[in-house]
């Protein structure tokens, strides 16, 4: 009896694992083995596929074959007993195009109100993704074990910290990788769970802000308690993208080590041009807080995000404010080539009650003012990029008196 060729051959590639699956054509015939050949583009001869010769099952692994993953290959299979079936040719394919990204490895560390997630590619030193290692981004789904309400976080890198969690609570998460350059979305990792710790005695510092004054950066933060010492550290932001490396060499800012105030001042030349992460830690001599949330600090934006200058045209019941480009020391305007949003604070000169307007436009009306009253105005600029989230310092306050009634036209 003639042996029939196997049918429905499927090629599954996950990372560097190459798996073939097929269907037997004739279940009634026992003791049949299967063998594959492969052919590279531009070659006439077929080569035996190592790992897939004389296979008794309907699955084989040819991961040991060192292929050029960007080169098209063709496969063929036949059944063998005393005689052999005809060859069945599989559609040619390019391994890289066919490959799926496998589940990443996940390592979790817990604090009281935060979880640190370290993510590594599932296959170390992968051949398939050798040229794409730095292009991996990850997304995760996290939920409280008790509630199951899921939150999705997109576009994270190999180290990510989730804040504002509850102490003594079990959180579960799963992570998948993506190669956006190749339109590839990976497979989720297994679910990993971790319990946050009891609440720490000392909370971390909050609301860290960087501003520029003269040739210095001024770093400010808020803290709950007095009589504390603080230290500040920085890290190159790109290091969070380095796959497989989970040793982060945070560096001290020398002028911000063991400071006793909730701010520190250091020269701009401490940092070369670039994007950095900054974090602050508090200590009372016996206990130490966990590190604050890490803020992103872009020297380019920070250096040029100066307070806006503005002119006021006073009417009886409103001010018209015209915002212009800030001036450098030589009185030349600074060109800001990124979108800004303006925060305008105004108050009656005789009162402390401040009101605030947030506006994208550079001409702003401050309404509902009283005639013949002195109002003061100050403004600052913010970048509209959520991730950078930078703010200038406030401008000096400018005080003007509104006109007498009925001059609003």
């Amino acid at each position: 009896k003639n042996l029939k060729s196997p049918q429905k051959v499927e090629v599954d590639i996950i990372d560097d694992n190459f798996i073939l699956r097929w269907n037997r054509s004739d279940e009634s015939v026992g003791n049949v083995t299967f063998s594959f050949d492969y052919q590279k583009t531009g070659m006439d001869n077929w080569i035996k596929l190592s790992g897939c010769q004389n296979i008794t099952s309907t699955k084989c692994n040819f991961s040991s074959l060192k292929l050029n993953v960007y080169e098209e290959i063709k496969l063929r299979i036949r059944a063998e007993k005393e005689n052999t079936s005809s060859w069945y040719e599989v559609d040619s394919f390019t391994p890289f195009r066919k490959a799926q990204i496998g589940p990443p490895e996940v390592h979790l560390e817990a604090e009281d109100k935060a979880i640190v997630i370290h993510i590594s590619p599932g296959t170390k030193d992968s051949v398939m993704w050798a040229l794409d290692g730095l292009s991996f981004t990850y997304s995760l789904v996290i939920w409280k074990n008790s509630s199951g309400v899921e939150e999705r976080i997109e576009n994270i890198y190999s180290r990510h910290k989730i804040y504002k969690l509850s102490p003594e609570t079990t959180y579960c998460l799963k992570v998948k990788a993506a190669l956006l350059t190749s339109w590839k979305i990976g497979v989720y990792s297994p679910v990993h769970c971790i319990k946050t710790t009891v609440e720490n005695e000392l909370p971390p510092p909050e609301n860290i802000e960087v501003s520029v004054q003269n040739q210095n950066y001024v770093l400010k933060w808020d803290y709950t308690y007095a009589n504390m010492t603080f230290q500040v550290q920085w890290l190159h932001a790109f290091l969070k993208r380095n796959p497989g490396n989970h040793l982060y060499k945070w560096k001290q800012i020398p002028d911000c080590e063991n400071v006793k105030t909730t701010q520190c001042v250091f020269p701009q030349n401490v940092f070369q041009k670039g994007i950095y992460l900054l974090r602050v830690q508090a200590s009372d001599g016996n206990n130490t807080s966990f590190w604050s949330e890490e803020i992103k600090f872009d020297t380019e934006i920070q250096a040029f995000l100066l307070p806006p200058v503005f002119n006021i045209r006073s009417l009886s019941d409103s001010f018209h404010i015209y915002i212009g480009a800030p001036k450098q020391s030589g009185n030349t305007p600074v060109i800001q080539d990124y979108p800004l949003i303006y925060e305008i604070i105004f108050w009656e000169n005789t009162s402390n009650a401040e009101r605030k307007i947030i506006e994208k436009k550079t001409d702003v009306t401050v309404p509902n003012l009283k005639p013949l009253t002195v109002y003061c105005v100050k403004a600052r600029a913010h970048t509209m990029d959520e991730k950078l989230n930078k703010s200038s310092v406030f401008s000096d306050a400018v005080c003007e008196k509104t006109k007498p009634g009925n001059t609003s036209k």
Partner: antibody
């Protein structure tokens, strides 16, 4: 494979200094921290400090501050730990260890016995 | 400095027994705890890091748990080669500090 090979045993007089070396192979020392830990006879482990060979930044335990100096020579993949003003209670085995992923001291040298005796 | 208080200091046990070693930190260290095994005349060897992650090649009978201030190392079924001294260490803050050690002896 990763290896840390330390210099040989030393006998030194009280008040003198000792300099112990640790040569790494199978990895680039600039990508890691290098720690020093000591163990007095029959006692526990005590962290002395660490160096980042990439930029020579150091962190010392307050107990050793002012008496210890750590240096690195990246051209020979070697780190050094010098301890001065030695006293008898500094008699111990001194270990170097690599600080790797997740800040874990994952590989250790074989240890160097330093005996302080007059 | 953070104190790491390890107990017991000595533990007499037999092959096949389940053993628990505990470590208490004087302040919250998250999950930044490492467990080492040290045999006489040898350098310490990492068993568990980040409180519960076993180093590859370490037998599955070793497990770690805990967070905050209380940590545990468990050997589910002690083998002859496990008789050694075990140390915990916190890596949350400088200076790194170790527990005083637990010596596991044959009963």
């Amino acid at each position: 494979q990763v290896q840390l090979v330390q210099s040989g045993a030393e006998v030194v007089k009280p008040g003198a200094s000792v300099k112990v070396s640790c040569k790494g192979s199978g990895f680039n020392i600039k990508d890691y921290y290098m720690h020093w830990v000591r163990q007095a006879p029959g006692q526990g482990l005590e962290w002395i400090g660490r160096i980042d060979p990439e930029d020579a930044e150091t962190k010392y335990a307050p107990k050793f501050q002012g008496r210890v100096t750590m240096t690195a020579d990246t051209s020979t993949s070697t780190v050094y730990m010098e301890l001065s003003s030695l006293r008898s209670e500094d008699t111990a085995v001194y270990y170097c260890a690599r600080g790797g992923n997740f800040y874990v001291m994952d590989y250790w040298g074989q240890g160097t016995l330093v005996t302080v005796s007059s | 400095d953070i104190q790491m208080t390890q107990s017991p200091s000595f533990l007499s046990t037999s092959v096949g027994d389940r053993v628990t070693v505990t470590c208490k930190a004087s302040q919250n260290v998250g999950t930044n705890v490492v467990w080492y095994q040290q045999k006489p005349g040898k350098s310490p060897k990492v068993l568990i890091y980040s409180a519960s992650y076993r180093v590859s090649g370490v037998p599955s009978r070793f497990s770690g748990s805990g967070s905050g201030t209380e940590f545990t190392l468990i050997i589910s079924s002690v083998q002859p080669e496990d008789f050694a001294t075990y140390f915990c260490q916190q890596k949350n803050n400088y200076p790194y500090t170790f527990g005083q050690g637990t010596k596991l002896e044959i009963k």
